[in-house]
């Protein structure tokens, strides 16, 4: 579910609120060249939201995007 044309982007801060799962369309991971690890969620309204990959909800959403039927 990871876009082939992944943008080069970094997260400098993370969202402080959990996004409703049904708002999420896709995600990509930030580059190792970034100063901090990050996940960027793409919403169904084409917004990009930086999230902290150490948060459980972020991990669950990412996992569900790819492995849940």
């Amino acid at each position: 579910s990871l876009a082939a044309d992944t943008p080069t982007a970094c997260c400098f801060s993370y969202t402080s609120r959990q996004i409703p799962q049904n708002f999420i369309a896709d995600y990509f991971e930030t580059s190792s060249q970034c100063s901090k690890p990050g996940v960027i969620f793409l919403t169904k309204r084409s917004r990009q939201v930086c999230a902290d990959p150490s948060e459980e909800w972020v991990q669950k959403y990412v996992s569900d995007l790819e492995l849940s039927a």
């Epitope: 991971e29 930030t30 580059s31 190792s32 690890p37 990050g38 996940v39 990959p53 150490s54 459980e56 972020v58 991990q59 669950k60 990412v62 996992s63």
Partner: nanobody, 113 residues
Framework: EVQLVESGGGLVQPGGSLRLSCAAS????????MRWYRQAPGEQRELVAD???????NYRDSVKGRFTISRDNAKNTVYLQMNSLKPEDTAVYYC???????WGQGTQVTVSS
């Protein structure tokens, strides 16, 4: 710097078992979504299983009931127990941590009689 070292692969007969290990440094595996991928010759890399920091696990349909992902926090290591192996499980297996685009060298699993 994040480093992931996979091991435990080998040649096994159909129906056999293997346990793969992913030893991590530069990252605390218990804090991140840890994932096992595999890549067969001429195929794209595919996600096999993952485990969240809270211990929730997910599997691709073709390995459900046969593979089990787990983690040893004290050893900072993630495992993939593979049972009832099939020829179609033949691939190089890699582990990865969500948010870190670092890959190890992988470990080869060959299922053949």
């Amino acid at each position: 710097e994040v480093q992931l070292v996979e091991s435990g692969g080998g040649l096994v007969q159909p129906g056999g078992s293997l346990r793969l290990s992913c030893a991590a440094s530069g990252i605390i595996t218990s804090r991140y979504l840890m994932r096992w991928y595999r890549q067969a010759p001429g195929e794209q890399r595919e996600l096999v299983a993952d485990i969240t920091s809270g211990g929730s696990t997910n599997y691709r349909d073709s390995v459900k009931g046969r593979f089990t992902i787990s983690r040893d926090n004290a050893k900072n290591t993630v495992y993939l127990q593979m049972n009832s192996l099939k020829p179609e499980d033949t691939a190089v297996y890699y582990c990865k941590a969500l948010g870190f685009d670092r890959w190890g060298q992988g470990t080869q699993v060959t299922v053949s009689s």
